[in-house]
């Protein structure tokens, strides 16, 4: 039960995380105009990975796409790449994890196959989350660097009379969405990996040794425990009351392939 819950929760958390990564990637507010030195501006600037926007206090907003690839900063291209890789890996991970879910029956898929798929999707989620966190962090670092550079030459004057205020940019909402979403995807991936351990059948089954008692023929079966989900019959650690000695292989019962949660 715990394994199924962990797997299901991991899937849901990852799903929310990837939705957040997609939302963050599409958002225009990666960087927003810093209003500290000009809180009364009638024009507000903000920028995303794909376009920059200007919102006038009159309510009109104008957005312009970055219609060039070569003219964009390498860092911005890198952030775009990281976010897209994160989304692609996350999407593939979601697809794989749907088939890996223990509560979903697909043909005669073995638990070992489901365990492998769960692990694969978990790793994909972890990498996806790391890509998103890395992308957002690189962009944030770029903002911090540019912020202090523009602070250094904040005012350029003509004879000290005319002021030209340079626009500074600070963290936008998309950065926080990206960090949280990346974190959730990462957590979801870890949960999937944990769930995988519970799903994987252990192959180290020990042969049972039979002891013949003088009275009744009772075979005591030691060890040979498998990780069990608690579903289906499990006779591996029961006493076998019969007349002869038997190895465990003869009575081994695997959990049913057709269990539902």
């Amino acid at each position: 039960m715990a394994v199924t819950a962990c797997q299901g929760l991991g899937f849901v958390v990852s799903l929310i995380g990837i939705a957040g990564i997609i939302a963050a990637t599409c958002m225009d507010q990666w960087s927003t105009q810093d209003l500290y030195n000009n809180p009364v501006t009638a024009v507000f600037n903000y920028q995303g990975l794909w376009r920059s926007c200007v919102r006038e206090s009159s309510g009109f907003t104008e957005c312009r796409g970055y219609f060039t690839l070569l003219g964009l900063p390498a860092m911005l291209q890198a952030v775009r790449a990281l976010m897209i890789v994160g989304i692609v890996l996350g999407a593939i991970g979601l697809l794989v994890s749907i088939f890996a879910l223990k509560c979903i029956r697909i043909g005669s898929m073995e638990d070992s196959a489901k365990a492998n798929m769960t692990l694969t999707s978990g790793i994909m989620f972890i990498v996806s989350g790391l890509c998103a966190i890395a992308g957002v962090s690189v962009f944030a670092n770029m903002l911090v660097t540019n912020f202090w550079m523009s602070t250094a030459n904040m005012y350029t004057g003509m004879g000290g009379m005319v002021q030209t205020v340079q626009t500074r940019y600070t963290f936008g909402a998309a950065l926080f969405v990206g960090w949280v979403a990346g974190g959730l995807t990462l957590i979801g991936g870890v949960m999937m990996c944990i769930a995988c351990r519970g799903l994987a059948p252990e192959e180290t089954n020990y042969k049972a040794v039979s002891y013949h008692a003088s009275g009744h023929s009772v075979a005591y079966k030691p060890g040979g425990f498998k990780a069990s989900t608690g579903f289906g019959s499990n006779t591996k650690n029961k006493k076998i009351y019969d007349g002869g000695a038997r190895t465990e292989d003869e009575v081994q019962s695997y959990p049913s392939k057709h269990d539902y949660v």
Epitope: T41, A42, T167
Partner: antibody, heavy 118, light 113 residues
Framework: QVQLVQSGAEVKKPGASVKVSCKAS????????MNWVRQAPGQRLEWMGQ????????KYNGNFKGRVTITRDTSASTAYMELSSLRSEDTAVYYC???????????WGQGTLVTVSS | DIVMTQSPDSLAVSLGERATINCKSS????????????LTWYQQKPGQPPKLLIY???TRDSGVPDRFSGSGSGTDFTLTISSVQAEDVAVYYC?????????FGGGTKVEIK
Amino acid sequence: QVQLVQSGAEVKKPGASVKVSCKASGYAFSNYWMNWVRQAPGQRLEWMGQIYPGNGDTKYNGNFKGRVTITRDTSASTAYMELSSLRSEDTAVYYCARYYRGNCFDYWGQGTLVTVSS
Amino acid sequence: DIVMTQSPDSLAVSLGERATINCKSSQSLLNSGNQKNYLTWYQQKPGQPPKLLIYWASTRDSGVPDRFSGSGSGTDFTLTISSVQAEDVAVYYCQNAYTYPLTFGGGTKVEIK
């Protein structure tokens, strides 16, 4: 077509208050900021403040030290500007004006002359 | 507050001549986000409210004759009437549309010589 019709001229005593109305027609009143601008005789135009009828959000010119209150009645498509503690320097023509792209005033009311005299 | 300074205070031109009005702001009105200058020009005839002529320093409002043109960037702006007509007699104001409070220039009166 867009029209902004203001209330009639007023004569007030110093210390009193005046409330000028501006009825809008020909456009979606709730979707555009409404501004108030005044022009004292021989003086430059002076922006007083603005209101967004959609949610009642307001911005004011601090030079009026809280004497200006701008309100609206969306059902009547009307904006109001109240100026309190009137002084003789407040004698001016008061205009309402719609805020448009480029943060400019594209349509203006005909103006309301407010005379402050003892 | 941004201070808007217009020059000259008044201007007398002959019909058909060019008229040039200058406006200087105490702070740059250029927005880096869209490379637009937030400066507006208005025309006010006697007994009438102001009328919008040009916004974004150089964009003519609909219905404004093309003899009116705006230019300039940053802190220095110009309104040019290429061929003055009798109906252009008015006071012309520039306005800062970049920072609150929105401020106006002192006005330039255009008359016919």
